[in-house]
């Protein structure tokens, strides 16, 4: 068998939305990826499970079955939405994602992505992660990998 | 250390201009939008209006349209507020402010300068 | 513009009294991304204005707790439970959320 490559692509969009009284933040996060079957037979993705951290914490994770059937020499566009919540011993990012005087509110988010790909029986799991900036202080839709290459907002040293 | 620096007092003559600067350490002004507020002796606070340093873009309240004009030069971090033809009505103290991040946990810290007094007299 | 009302105007109290002030918008001043911006700012002769509220009730770092606000639509409070001597000045209440943003006229709170 040949390879099954699988490719972030980056973030597509981000939703935000906010509880005041919680002090928290709710982050819809759709991220899109290429997967191509390099066999000359066709491939099942079975599921794509994913999970994004802020801060080394986990604050959201999905997972999608039965997602669709990659024809020989092919490759497929998967975009799929991770629901984050960031709350609690994080809500000290309440104030800096609904603060007015900035402009952009870039975050730095780790995405961690997982597909299982099944032929003549056989599963394989490709994985991979990489970090994103992504703006949680209004919703954005962004250009195809455009959030990779986003400044973030540094204090002076 | 963050912090606003605001040039020293001034007294004009009716019908003059003055400009005042406020200077910022610790953060790039290029990132937050910055805010100018009048405050006029035994008065309350007034909001001026606010300026996007990096692209020059300012809002006003209508009271100050015409009548004072925001700019800012990111390459020596500074906002500037201009006034002109000058009144007794522009006696104040004039503050600039933003509120900020000051360190990499993204907390927030409301910024003020220490003020500039204008006087106007004959 | 929103135009914001405080009441009173004037407000004596003695020291470890309770202290209350309103402050009312002429229109919601819920902010597209749907939070309130009302803020509370203490300001000293002398001195620049300190934030003490934002976004209705959330206390700013360094703010005693002693300091609580409230208020929903067009209709805000600020409560000072005991009021102790460094709490004497004008308090504003202020809306940051439609441009132009706009002040309060101030509440002076003093020694009875």
């Known amino acids: 068998p040949r390879s099954i490559e699988v490719k972030y692509i980056g973030v597509k969009s981000a939703y935000v939305s906010y509880d005041a009284e919680k002090r928290t933040i709710y982050l819809n996060i759709t991220n899109t990826l290429n997967i191509t079957n390099n066999n000359y037979y066709s491939v099942e993705v079975e599921n794509i499970t994913a999970q994004v951290q802020f801060s080394k914490t986990v604050i959201g994770k999905a997972r999608l079955n039965n997602i669709t059937n990659i024809g020989p020499l092919d490759m497929k566009q998967i975009d799929y939405t991770v629901p984050t919540v960031i709350a609690e011993e994080m809500s000290y990012m309440y104030d800096f994602c609904t603060l007015l005087s900035i402009k952009v509110h870039n975050i730095v988010l780790m995405m961690q992505v997982t597909v299982t790909t099944a032929y003549f029986g056989h599963s394989e799991q490709i994985s991979q992660e990489r970090y994103q900036y992504v703006d949680c202080g209004r919703n954005t839709t962004y250009q195809l990998a455009q959030s990779e290459y986003l400044n973030v907002l540094q204090p002076q040293q | 250390e963050v912090q606003l620096q605001q040039s020293g007092a001034e007294l004009m003559r009716p019908g003059a201009s003055v400009k005042l600067s406020c200077t910022a350490s610790?953060?790039?002004?290029?990132?937050?939008?910055m805010y100018w507020v009048k405050q006029r002796p035994e008065q309350g606070l007034e909001w001026i209006g606010r300026i996007d340093p990096e692209d020059g873009d300012a809002e006003y309240a209508p009271k100050f349209q015409g009548k004072a004009t925001m700019t800012a030069d990111t390459s020596s971090n500074t906002a500037y507020l201009q006034l002109s033809s000058l009144t007794s009505e522009d006696t104040a103290v004039y503050y600039c402010?933003?509120?900020?991040?000051?360190?990499?946990?993204?907390?927030?810290?409301?910024?003020w300068g220490q003020g500039t007094s204008v006087t106007v007299s004959s | 513009d929103v135009l914001m009302t405080q009441i009173p105007l004037s407000l004596p109290v003695s020291l470890g009294d309770q202290a209350s002030i309103s402050c009312r918008s002429s229109q919601t001043i819920v902010h597209s991304n749907g939070n309130t911006y009302l803020e509370w700012y203490l300001k000293k002769p002398g001195q620049s204005p300190k934030l003490l509220i934002d976004k209705i009730s959330n206390r700013f770092s360094g703010v005693p707790d002693r300091f609580s606000g409230s208020g929903s639509g067009t209709d805000f409070t600020l409560k000072i439970s005991r009021v102790e001597a460094e709490d004497l000045g004008v308090y504003y209440c202020f809306q940051g959320s439609h441009v132009p943003y706009t002040f309060g006229g101030g509440t002076k709170l003093e020694i009875k």
């Open positions: 402010s933003t509120r900020v991040i000051y360190d990499g946990y993204y907390r927030t810290m409301d910024c």
């Open positions: 610790g953060f790039n002004i290029q990132d937050y939008y």
